[in-house]
């Protein structure tokens, strides 16, 4: 094991020289520790701000985590000859704030890429195509780990941020490989719809922490090969019966569903039916409502129909007032009605007199505009009592 | 209305086990979890684990395995749960109480005692 | 485990005041805690779910706040049957955790 821990102000000469000619295939670079024999390169915790140009041409397996990087460019890792090798690159922690276009360029045999815990203000829809073509090669990408990149609210760009990254997913149809995609903790409110349709060959999606109210727009259908599906820790009310039968229809999936605040009405009973007599679910007796509190707790397993009823819209005794009601402002608006049209040759010398005044006071209007807009009248316009 | 009802007061001798009842009326026993909490003086309150007794799932803490085994009776709407080679650090006041995310009742509480 | 942290053993207090009882998740939980009064010699009992839900029957000047890692139980016109011991409660994983408790007194 070679290792290189030189002061950091070194770095940037190293860096330089290293640039300057092509590096040699066993060196380390400074400030990382190298293992030939395992065929990885950790560069951990060092407040690196670019990635190092001197990478061993065997590195297989990249540790750049805890560092200062903040912008990853086009061709970050390209090199000349290109790290053939390089299957696993972990940039988790390293303050990240932007992933340009063409950032994983001319890795060919990538299969693993970590990005989480950055604040990702801007990820390129090509970060991971590589290319604006319409269908760009395919990545090499099988798993894309992308937890906790959600920036905070001030470095957020005016666009979505579920969006950017569903983008960046479906861009070139490069992913239609991805084996594994882990987006928990990102906030997302919901999951844009065309997003899974452009990734058949996902086996896990973890989708945990996140705070999707209803999957009602989100399609399943094609993902056939999908075995875990984690919706923990979300917002998620109720399923609806369109998912309920994606996910049944599902060869092999298991469904992770704790820790949301279900809510216990008669839009659960479909819901409550399917769960009883699915082996999707797993741990489905925790399972348990949230809201309203008079089932808080209460088990969805141990539910019946009776349970499940929904507050009618107006108890009947509200919806007879609501009839009188509206039968006395119906008359009221009669009665105005009629006085209006008792009193239209009144009205309609009124509405004379308001016209001639409205036409005498934008005429003074009229007047002082054409004062302001003349360039030798301002000191009169300012004085002026129109 | 929901009552949770523990039995009395224990004196227990180190090494020995001890079974705590907790009988449940007012609801529908099988519908919820029943969880047992733990309350020494200056250690405040410590979750045990629970039982959802119609079904016999249980969730323990780490700390209580090899200590707490929990058990249901649904002809008596009853939970047990037994604690197995006491030590003096076992004295405290055990608590059942109804949840899962939060505990929404509580019984009385079960004073246990180990002394030799 | 999620640590929840509550570092102000006890509180002095008057009738009337306005009370702040503070609780740290060592990890972000959410909004999935509980607070509960516990009296001398009695049970605890549930004021708070969901970090400010109140449960039916708990008096009015009882709110909680907080997301993520702090949260806040606010009594706004102290009463001396408020006299108690207060625990927050974290339920987004297990095992479930208590606060140390916080106690309040009459000055």
């Known amino acids: 094991t070679s290792s290189a821990s030189s002061s950091s102000s070194s770095a940037p000469f190293l860096a330089s020289a290293a640039s300057a000619q092509p590096p040699l295939p066993d060196q380390c670079p400074a400030l990382c520790e190298c293992s030939e024999a395992a065929r990885t390169v950790k560069c951990v915790n060092r407040n690196l701000t670019e990635v190092p140009t001197d990478l061993p041409l065997y590195v297989r397996n990249l540790f750049l985590t805890g560092n200062q990087l903040a912008v990853l460019p086009a061709g970050a890792f390209a090199r000349r000859p290109p790290l053939a090798e390089l299957a696993a690159l972990n940039l988790s922690g390293s303050r990240l704030d932007e992933v340009r276009g063409g950032a994983f360029e001319h890795l060919p045999s990538l299969r693993q890429l970590d990005l989480s815990h950055n604040p990702l203000a801007y990820l390129s829809p090509f970060a991971f195509s590589g290319s604006n073509a319409s269908i760009s090669a395919p990545s090499p990408l099988v798993e894309l780990i992308l937890n906790h990149i959600v920036p905070p609210d001030d470095k957020r760009q005016n666009r979505s941020f579920e969006g950017m990254v569903a983008a960046a997913l479906v861009a070139g149809r490069a992913l239609q490989g991805l084996h594994l995609l882990e987006l928990a903790s990102n906030h997302f409110l919901y999951l844009p719809r065309d997003v899974l349709a452009q990734l058949p060959s996902l086996r896990y999606l973890d989708l945990s922490n996140n705070s999707l109210v209803s999957l009602t727009y989100v399609s399943f259908r094609n993902l056939t090969h999908l075995e875990s599906l984690h919706l923990e820790d979300n917002a998620l009310k109720v399923l609806h019966n369109g998912t309920l039968a994606e996910l049944q229809g599902l060869p092999h999936v298991r469904v992770f569903l704790d820790n949301n605040p279900w809510v216990c009405d008669c839009h659960m009973a479909d819901m409550v039916t399917w769960l009883k007599q699915t082996g999707v679910v797993q741990g489905k007796d925790r399972l348990t409502c949230a809201f309203p509190e008079k089932m808080r707790n209460r088990v969805l397993l141990e539910l019946n129909s009776a349970d499940l009823d929904c507050d009618p819209i107006l108890p009947p005794s509200l919806q007879t007032s609501y009839v009188f009601l509206g039968i006395v402002l119906a008359l009221i608006g009669a009665i105005f009605l009629l006085v209006l049209y008792l009193n239209r040759k009144g009205i309609k010398k009124w509405m004379h007199n308001i016209r001639d005044a409205c036409r005498d006071h934008m005429e003074g209007y009229h007047y002082r505009y054409e004062i302001n807009a003349d360039p030798r009248l301002t000191n009169l316009s300012s004085n002026s009592d129109v | 209305q929901v009552q949770l009802q523990q039995s009395g007061a224990e004196l227990m001798k180190p090494g020995a086990s001890v079974k705590l009842a907790c009988k449940a009326t007012?609801?529908?026993?099988?519908?919820?979890?029943i969880e047992w909490v733990k309350q020494r003086p200056g250690h405040g309150l410590e979750w045990i684990g629970e039982i959802l007794p119609g079904r016999g799932s249980t969730n323990s803490n780490e700390k209580f395995k090899g200590k707490a085994t929990f058990t249901a009776d649904t002809s008596s709407n009853t939970v047990y749960m037994q604690l197995s080679s006491l030590t003096t650090e076992d004295s405290a006041i055990f608590y059942c109480?109804?949840?899962?995310?939060?505990?929404?009742?509580w019984g009385q509480g079960t004073t246990l005692t180990v002394s030799s | 485990d999620i640590v929840m942290t509550q570092s102000q053993k006890f509180m002095s207090t008057t009738v009337g005041d306005r009370v702040s009882i503070i609780c740290k998740a060592s990890?972000?939980?959410?909004?999935?805690v509980a607070w509960y009064q516990q009296k001398p010699g009695q049970s605890p009992k549930v004021l708070i779910y969901?970090?400010?839900n109140r449960y039916t029957g708990v008096p009015d000047r009882f709110t909680g706040s907080g997301s993520g890692t702090d949260f806040t139980l606010t009594i706004s016109n102290m009463q001396s049957e408020d006299l108690a011991d207060y625990f927050c409660?974290?339920?987004?994983?297990?095992?479930?955790?208590f606060g140390g408790g916080t106690k309040l007194e009459i000055k």
């Open positions: 990890q972000n939980v959410g909004t999935a």
């Open positions: 109480a109804r949840g899962y995310r939060d505990f929404d009742y």
């Open positions: 007012g609801y529908t026993f099988t519908a919820y979890w």
């Open positions: 969901s970090a400010s």
């Open positions: 409660q974290q339920y987004t994983s297990y095992p479930r955790t």
